[in-house]
């Protein structure tokens, strides 16, 4: 289930240009903005998706408290540099030669500097906390039903193995989905938790990245689960390095 042969499209990434010019006349798809060939049987990396997005025309608590090293993507969109495999390069710079280091999901993890800034390695984000608030419902969702549906969603829609969904917490109206994936746990072919989280984030905003597949229709025992806000926290294997100035 790579690129769909019949009409030569990429089921997992609508931000591609596809043509039957692959080996043996097979459908091959390339990401907009970068021209990198993508595997349409799995999720496209967040780096290539952000690059494509920038190239497109403009138009009693059971809940987890993120620790002090948790990062939130406050910087918004930027046009990233991706390596040949589609991963974020550790150092990102803008057109005015301002540079910063990012983690594996492309979120800034240092203060901004100049072209002399060094980012020795791409630090892996190994724990992602997706914090959702759902619209009011007549009654709270059953926690175990909600847990089951969200795990199934991540497996079937985003192809993320259930072992990487560490927990689903619920305290009406807040839902928290914890994704965990250490470097040692991630095998070849496994979807990255960062990519799954990004696809999910776009889905809940009504901006599905899937081609031809319907938008996200999440139901728990037939009751629609409608998300009204999303906040995503990222925890890296090595804590971020910000100056005290930013923390005050």
């Amino acid at each position: 289930h790579t690129a769909a042969q019949d009409n030569c499209t990429c089921p997992t990434n609508k931000m591609t240009v596809c043509s039957p010019d692959g080996p043996g006349g097979r459908c091959q798809c390339r990401a907009l903005g970068s021209g990198v060939a993508v595997d349409c049987s799995t999720l496209t990396s967040k780096c290539l998706l952000l690059k494509a997005r920038m190239s497109a025309p403009k138009n009693a608590r059971t809940l987890v408290r993120p620790n002090e090293h948790a990062l939130v993507d406050n910087d918004g969109l930027y046009d990233p540099d991706c390596d040949p495999e589609g991963r974020f390069k550790a150092r990102q710079c803008n057109q005015t030669s301002v540079c910063w280091c990012v983690n594996s999901v492309g979120v800034r993890r240092t203060d901004k500097g100049d072209l002399s800034l060094r980012c020795d390695e791409l630090v892996r984000t190994h724990h992602i906390l997706i914090d959702l608030r759902h619209r009011p419902t007549a009654s709270a969702f059953n926690h175990s039903d909600l847990d089951a549906e969200l795990r199934r969603l991540f497996r079937e829609r985003y192809r993320l193995h259930p072992k990487f969904v560490a927990a689903v917490h619920y305290e009406q109206p807040t839902i928290q989905i914890e994704l965990r994936q250490n470097t040692s746990q991630k095998a070849a072919g496994d979807v990255d938790i960062g990519d799954a989280a990004y696809y999910f984030e776009r889905d809940v905003k009504g901006e599905s990245l899937f081609q031809g597949r319907g938008g996200l229709d999440l139901r728990v025992r037939g009751e629609p689960l409608q998300v009204e806000r999303t906040l995503i926290y990222y925890l890296d294997e090595i804590p971020p390095k910000f100056s005290m100035k930013r923390l005050t």
Epitope: R151, V191, G212
Partner: antibody, heavy 118, light 109 residues
């Protein structure tokens, strides 16, 4: 790597029965385990599934309520069945997915026969 | 996601070819498997992802299709191919009655 079902029996209508699936040679936590049944001379019928990591269970619409699946030890999964009728007479198989995120069943037990009759 | 398999039974001579079709009620994105089952045995995975051969399966077995329409073709039939074949959608287990097609009995003359 192998699976083996046990617990099949001749039971009366209305009875309950628990089947056990014993796994050998692999770590259950990396897989989903599914139960499938086959009535004599009929086709395969999916009953339900458990994601071992997380323990969440899923059932065919006709099986919801009367069937339950659980992981009972590091190597065993059970299928509990209640209010059995003659229509539940079948060979019951447990099967393992291939460790991907699809539900391809690449390892099956030999099956255990359940007969519901008065 | 109902799976409709045709025909229910097919007969062909040794060395011949049989074709089995499977139709899904909705797009299953090529997440389709084919199984072979012989009497008294559990099913055996033959093909996954609509066209990829499982380990040890001879290349006489060929799967094809996409969207909602899928086909299993067995060429150069051998006596040992006499069995019942089932398709299975491996895309979702949400709100469904069955993941399997009804089965096709292959008789080799």
């Amino acid at each position: 790597q192998s699976l083996e079902e046990s617990g099949g029996d001749l039971v009366q209508p209305g009875a309950s029965l628990t089947l056990t699936c014993k796994a050998s040679g692999f770590d259950l936590n990396n897989y989903a385990m599914l139960w499938v049944r086959q009535a004599p001379g009929k086709g395969l019928e999916w009953i339900g599934c458990i994601y071992i990591s997380g323990g969440t269970t899923y059932f065919a619409s006709w099986a919801t309520g009367r069937f339950a699946i659980s992981k009972t030890s590091s190597t065993t999964v059970t299928l509990q069945m209640t209010s059995l009728t003659a229509a539940d007479t079948a060979t019951y198989f447990c099967a393992r997915d291939d460790g991907s995120t699809s539900y391809y069943l690449n390892l099956w037990g030999p099956g255990t026969l359940v007969t519901v009759s008065s | 996601y109902d799976m409709t398999q045709t025909p229910a039974s097919v007969s062909a001579a040794v060395g011949g070819t049989v074709t089995i079709k499977c139709q899904a009620s909705e797009d299953i994105y090529s997440l389709l498997a084919w199984y072979q089952q012989k009497p008294g045995q559990p099913p055996k995975l033959l093909i996954y992802d609509a066209s990829d051969l499982a380990s040890g399966v001879p290349s006489r077995f060929k799967g094809s299709g996409s969207g909602t329409e899928y086909t299993l073709t067995i060429s150069a039939l051998e006596c040992d191919d006499a069995a019942t074949y089932y398709c299975q959608q491996a895309y979702t287990i949400g709100n469904i009655d069955n993941t399997f097609g009804g089965g096709t009995e292959v008789v080799v003359k």
